[in-house]
């Protein structure tokens, strides 16, 4: 167990635990002091005790040693009075540190006493060699436990120069492959540096003679070290391992090194000492096996080979940890090592070995694990696991310690948890104590909560309800007990209801530049606080203060002016602080395709053929397949700025090959269509020109016609430039009478026409035209039939007669007039016809002619829309393209027809049952007026009841109908009659019912001049007359409030004028009607331009 | 009279990038494109891409394609030609030319800008 | 890429002499080839193109021939202004390759 810092006011005891000690091997120089450290923790205070070798050491009671007075060392010096005084302390220590809890226990300490370093007293004899032999000076400094650093150097101090021929070994010795005479010297020292003690010691000068020779001999190379074929050595694993092969021989030897088992790790190896010394860094199982060194020279080679071994000393596998019990646990102490040899292990208890301790221990040791079951506090103790082999020991100490704790409930109570419906609530109830207390969860009712399934509890008190119920809303009781005590807190859960999203955003697909709405409808917990907010792609949108792109409100996302861009799932995120929902949909934005990026010409060498080959990049194609490419062309010099399109091709298909024309500055475009329409165009091509050729078309709609009586106008379309196949074309204009066979005239022009002169009226000719450049001619063109000038027709169309149709329309026919008198091509007749008047009366009026063009090939006409019983003018003439010819006259009258509607009925109500009709005659007679007819029948009778009669004064300009119901509307009709019956009616609706109830004065109004007042209104169409008083009363003190005696009006009258009225006076207007008040208004008269002086009482400024 | 004027002669290090120039006068610089073509010593001649400097739509050959960029300045009527990660085989007469009006022919050459690359 | 090979790579004639100068496209171009005079230290010229069409200002005794892979530059009377190195290009297809050159020297 672990004590959680939350759980306080619990003083636990520690047991020691070794915080620093010395190293395992102390090496002490003659004039060092000795220290020993020794330093732990614990609570209660530590004790400490050492041994040495085995036996109980107290430093106290030996001379000159000082015991550091701290509460948590165990630490003492020893100082020396004389220099060899170490030797008498060396040995292997260990500090024990013990408090009631247990004992933990240091490392062995190895204290070794190092002696000021001496060579021994030698006679070194002078060293004599032949010139080209090898020889070996020796060092062999004294022993140290410390390492030392070699130096050869001469009575001067200089280093001895070392390469491939003289080197220093590892041990020391200088070797020499060969000696040269410039080797002789007597003055070879070997310096020893012993770094602990910090003194340089130097050998006795070794004097190295060589002796010259005349011929030197070369040998083969032979090993100087090491001197036999093969060694084997142990490297230990994450140690350096360094192999070394000096050898001799002449010429001077070279080293190689191989390794026959493997792949040398060439990331760990480096070749040192001119490659005699090869060094492997950390060395690992992989490393194991032979390594060979190769000395070479011109005459043959020496080898030797290394078998390595690798070991290592122990190290953990699993190192015993230190814990806290609590009662009735099972502590396991892993103590898992390895090495090579495997170690050995073993264990102790406070410091004592176990196979020293009574049999009865609990205690049971299986596979390199100490176990003891169902602990209690009499089981506390610091435990220590040694491994040992041959290169080393390791050593930890792991206490086991059993601790009794009260209870505890470390989550604060009275929590409330809210969660919404369908969610997991997670109640805490973090609970400590040793044993560990077993927890509880209750309801109110104090029952378990666990046998609803949906209630499930956690390891580490928390109580889990999944698929949350509103009703599952109420108080929950956490109970934690042990053997000590037990503690309560109580949890209050509120559920919550969830959020729903109602209506989510619909993925949708819209065009580009247009906008698009989402909307979210969101049902939320009204207690909580609610959020809806928008994501696209995972992002968080937000409206930018700075651009107007994104708009959002109430629930909706607008994003306005869509891009491609703008593609993408948008969400909509419905949350509170309890929950978060999210619905997405998805947008699509479509549109025209983007630019084709790029444009290549190509078989630029078909422009002879006047073609080329377009390819093309596809375009995007923004969501809506591309259904095709149009290919357009420019010709700068042409047309700049005008594009035309030379086809389409399939939206899959990015080249084509070109029908050109020729001599045309080509530059090209590419334009991706899809169903929104077409996209940007590519960037231009190169322009490339065709080369020229004669015309491959001539000109159309050729036609001859004279402007004059003596010409012929010979005119065409001219081509249009693209057919012009070079820079200019001319036109060939041959003619000559038709019919002749004779030979033909012709001309060559620039201008799209040509005046043939001199010609006789109206002669027929036969005409070609064709396309001339400087490359040739257009094909043989198509022969027209053109004419010289026209001149007036001389024929006069004869009548045939006119049949009168009807009233308003007459058929005029006439006969075919002589072509041979047309003078030209007949076109047609013009017919001219004018009304000069009625039958009744002769007007004085602007006579206004109609025309009627009539084809060539038709000689009669229906002249309609005449006017009844009139008098007309007719000319007839033909006419060519010259003009018209002389005419031919008639003139014609048309009968009687019915008359046009009476003019402006109106409906005058005399009483509840009588009406007056009053009307205008018809604008058109259309003949002599005989009278009128008159029908009435009441509207809600659907027609039936229709009364009739006729009225036989044309004169006659009124009616009073008598007899009519009161409660009932009426539908009049009024038709004017001729010979030819009754004409087109005017209708009025009416009544006396809805006419006769309260008078209504309508749009009444009152003016003023100096002495009357003129009082208008306008009567209500059919209103029953009726009369009426108008009163007018001068208003004012001086007026007395003065009236003028009421005058009788009739409502039909429309105004009245009342005179004898003051100037500069207001007056009240009253209407009376059978002495009911029905109306007021007010007037002022005019002033007379005398200065009035104000009524008495008032003010003046 | 047309005319082509590119800047002076230039000595580069390995790995540097030049920029020749190329100023044009006598006729509407927007209306013929500007192509750029280079002479190694005692060598042919060798196209490299050019310009439509109505558009600023450029192409280049593949050899050159990520190493090449010619723009264009209107205003100033002046066609640019940008060689960067530049190599010893660059060492070269790099001419400005203006093609023909219809077809990929060299009508007009600027005088030619020697650059040396040399480290 | 079109290859365009001349040859021979240099000649040496005398004046008055008729010169011929052949080049070989490595495919079809149909007549789409230009040729081009470089005098020593200027700046190259364009003689024809459409294989056989003179370039304005060009004197009529330079002339040239041929389509698809096989093209001729003849001068008809050499003259010593006629020193120069000349080179064929073709136009049919990007990128735009010219030949390695045909070195021309009055004996």
């Known amino acids: 167990i672990q004590i959680p810092e939350e759980y306080e006011g619990h003083h636990v005891m520690e047991p020691p635990v070794i915080t620093e000690q010395s190293p395992r091997r102390l090496v002490v120089f003659p004039t060092d002091d000795i220290s020993l450290k020794c330093e732990a923790s614990g609570k209660p205070e530590v004790q400490f005790r050492w041994t040495r070798d085995g036996v109980h050491f107290k430093p106290k009671e030996e001379l000159g040693v000082t015991v550091y007075q701290s509460p948590h060392s165990g630490s003492f010096t020893i100082t020396g009075n004389n220099s060899n005084f170490a030797q008498r302390f060396q040995g292997i220590y260990r500090c024990f540190a013990s408090n009631k809890l247990g004992t933990a226990m240091s490392h062995e300490i190895r204290l070794m006493a190092e002696g000021a370093p001496k060579w021994p007293k030698e006679t070194v004899k002078p060293v004599e060699v032949e010139e080209g032999e090898s020889v070996v000076l020796p060092c062999n400094p004294p022993p140290s436990a410390e390492p030392l650093r070699i130096y050869w150097m001469n009575s001067k101090i200089l280093h001895i120069k070392q390469d491939e021929r003289v080197t220093m070994g590892q041990n020391g010795n200088l070797y020499f492959a060969n000696v040269l005479t410039s080797d002789n010297h007597s003055d070879y020292i070997c310096h020893a540096h012993f770094p602990g003690t910090r003194t340089i010691i130097q050998k006795e000068p070794i004097d190295l003679r060589v002796k010259a020779t005349n011929s030197m001999i070369d040998r083969k190379p032979r090993l100087l070290f090491p001197t036999n074929s093969s060694s084997h050595l142990v490297a230990l694993q994450g140690q350096p391992l360094v192999l070394e092969c000096i050898a001799e021989g002449f010429p001077t030897p070279t080293i190689k090194w191989l390794r026959p088992s493997g792949p040398m790790p060439a990331d760990r190896v480096t070749y040192q000492n001119h490659n005699k010394t090869l060094q492997l860094l950390k060395v690992g199982e992989e490393d194991d096996g032979e390594y060979r060194c190769l000395a070479e020279n011109s005459l043959g080679s020496a080898r030797h080979a290394y078998y390595v071994t690798v070991e290592a000393a122990p190290y953990w596998l699993h190192k015993p940890q230190s814990h806290l019990y609590g009662p009735g646990e099972t502590a396991r102490l892993d103590c898992q090592v390895q090495g090579r040899p495997q170690p050995e292990v073993t264990w102790r208890i406070n410091g004592i070995p176990v196979e020293e301790l009574a049999k009865d221990q609990k205690y049971r040791i299986q596979r390199g694990a100490l176990i003891l079951s169902n602990v209690q506090p009499s089981d506390t103790m610091v435990t220590q696991c040694e491994a040992r082999n041959r290169h080393g020991l390791l050593l930890a100490n792991a206490y086991i310690y059993v601790v009794q704790l009260p209870a505890k409930i470390l989550t604060a109570d009275n929590q409330t948890y809210m969660a919404v419906q369908g969610s997991t609530a997670y109640l805490l109830c973090k609970a400590f104590g040793a044993p560990v207390p077993s927890v509880q969860w209750l309801d109110e009712d104090g029952t378990t909560v666990l046998q609803d399934e949906r209630f499930f509890p956690y390891a580490n008190g928390t109580l889990g309800i999944r698929d949350l119920q509103a009703n599952d809303t109420g108080r929950y009781f956490c109970l934690a007990a042990n053997d000590q005590n037990n503690v309560t807190i109580m949890a209050n859960l509120k559920v919550k209801d969830a959020t729903q999203i109602t209506q989510g955003p619909r993925s949708t697909i819209e065009k580009k530049g247009s906008r698009v709405t989402f909307t979210c409808q969101a049902s939320f917990d009204p207690s909580l606080q609610p959020s809806i907010t928008w994501r696209g792609d995972g992002r968080d949108l937000q409206e930018l203060g700075d651009s107007d792109k994104y708009f959002i409100e109430d629930g909706r996302l607008v994003i306005h002016s869509l891009d491609y861009s703008d593609q993408g799932n948008y969400s909509c995120v419905a949350s509170t602080e309890l929950d978060v929902v999210e619905s997405r949909a998805q947008l699509l934005v479509v549109g025209s395709p983007g630019p084709v990026p790029r444009l290549v010409l190509s078989d630029l060498h078909l422009l002879t053929q006047s073609q080329v080959r377009v390819s093309w990049s596809p375009a995007e194609d923004h969501n809506a397949p591309i259904e095709k490419y149009d290919i357009e062309f420019e010709d700068k010099e042409m047309a700049p700025e005008k594009w035309y399109s030379l086809g389409k091709v399939p939206g899959n298909q990015t080249s084509t090959t070109l029908k050109l024309s020729p001599y045309v500055h080509y530059t090209f475009r590419v334009t991706a269509i899809n169903k929104y329409g077409p996209g940007e165009p590519s960037p231009v091509s190169e322009t490339v020109v065709t080369p020229e050729a004669a015309p491959e078309k001539n000109p159309v709609d050729v036609k001859g016609e004279g402007n004059e009586t003596t010409n012929m106008v010979i005119t065409w379309k001219p081509l249009r430039w693209m057919d012009w196949n070079a820079p200019q074309v001319q036109y060939r204009v041959q003619w000559r009478p038709q019919g002749t066979r004779g030979p033909w005239q012709e001309q060559i022009v620039s201008d799209p026409f040509l005046v043939v002169s001199n010609t006789s009226t109206f002669v027929p000719y036969e005409i070609k035209v064709q396309a001339v450049n400087s490359q040739g001619k257009g094909p043989e063109p198509q022969v027209t039939i053109g004419y010289s000038g026209e001149d007036y027709p001389q024929a006069i169309p004869e009548l045939e007669g006119i049949e009168i149709l009807n009233s308003s329309a007459v058929l005029v026919k006439w006969r075919p007039v002589d072509l041979a008198q047309v003078k030209g091509h007949l076109r047609g007749y013009n017919v001219t016809y004018w009304r000069e008047g009625s039958q009744r009366k002769h007007s004085k009026r602007h006579i206004h002619k109609d025309h009627v063009v009539v084809p060539a090939n038709t000689t009669s006409v229906i002249l309609s829309g005449l006017r009844p019983y009139s008098s007309y003018h007719l000319e007839v003439q033909a006419f060519n393209g010259r003009g018209s010819g002389p005419a031919s006259e008639f003139t014609f009258s048309t009968p009687e027809g019915v008359p046009g509607h009476p003019e402006a009925l109106h409906l005058e109500c005399q009483s509840n049952t009588s009406l007056l009709l009053r009307w205008q005659p018809p604008l058109s007679h259309n003949g002599v007026l005989t009278g009128y007819v008159l029908s009435y029948h009441p509207l809600d009778e659907g027609g039936k009841g229709q009364l009739s009669f006729n009225l036989r004064d044309p004169e006659l300009r009124t009616h009073n109908l008598t007899d009519l119901s009161p409660h009932l509307r009426y539908r009049f009709q009024l038709q004017a009659t001729t010979k030819e019956g009754p004409g087109e009616a005017i209708v009025r609706e009416g009544g006396t019912m809805a006419l006769s109830g309260i008078s209504d004065f309508g749009n009444i109004s009152a003016t003023a001049g100096e002495n009357y007042s003129v009082v208008s209104w306008v009567p209500k169409e059919g209103q029953c007359n009726f009369r009426f008083h108008i009163l007018f009363k001068a208003l004012g003190e001086e007026k007395g409030g003065a009236s003028l005696s009421p005058q009788y009006v009739s409502y039909n009258q429309s105004s009245y004028t009342q005179w004898d009225l003051q100037p500069d006076t207001d007056y009240e207007i009253h209407l009376f009607k059978e002495r009911m008040f029905r109306h007021q208004m007010a007037v002022k008269t005019n002033g007379t331009g005398r200065v009035r002086l104000p009524p008495a009482g008032f003010a003046t400024e | 009279q047309v005319q082509l004027v590119q800047s002076g002669a230039e000595v580069k290090k390995p790995g540097s990038s030049v920029k020749v120039s190329c100023k044009a006068s006598g006729y509407t610089f927007t209306n013929y494109w500007i192509q750029w073509v280079r002479q190694a010593p005692g060598q042919g001649l060798e196209w490299m891409g050019y310009i439509n400097p109505s558009t600023y739509y450029s192409d280049y050959a593949q050899k050159f394609q990520g190493r090449v960029t010619i723009t264009a300045d209107e205003s100033t009527s002046t066609a640019y030609m940008e060689l960067s990660s530049l190599r010893s085989e660059d060492t070269a007469v790099y001419y400005c030319?203006?093609?023909?009006?219809?077809?990929?022919?060299?009508?007009?050459w600027g005088q030619g800008t020697t650059v040396t690359v040399s480290s | 890429d079109i290859q365009m090979t001349q040859s021979p790579s240099s000649l040496s004639a005398s004046v008055g002499d008729r010169v011929t100068i052949t080049c070989r496209a490595s495919?079809?171009?149909?007549?789409?080839v230009a040729w081009y005079q470089q005098k020593p230290g200027k700046v190259p010229k364009l003689l024809i193109y459409w294989a056989s069409t003179l370039h304005s200002g060009v004197p009529s005794r330079f002339s040239g021939s041929g389509s698809g892979t096989d093209f001729t530059l003849t001068i008809s009377s050499l003259q010593p202004e006629d020193v120069a190195t000349y080179y064929c290009?073709?136009?049919?297809?990007?990128?735009?390759?010219f030949g390695g050159g045909t070195k021309v020297e009055i004996k």
């Open positions: 495919q079809d171009v149909g007549t789409a």
């Open positions: 290009q073709q136009y049919s297809n990007y990128p735009l390759t």
């Open positions: 030319a203006r093609r023909q009006f219809g077809l990929p022919l060299f009508d007009y």
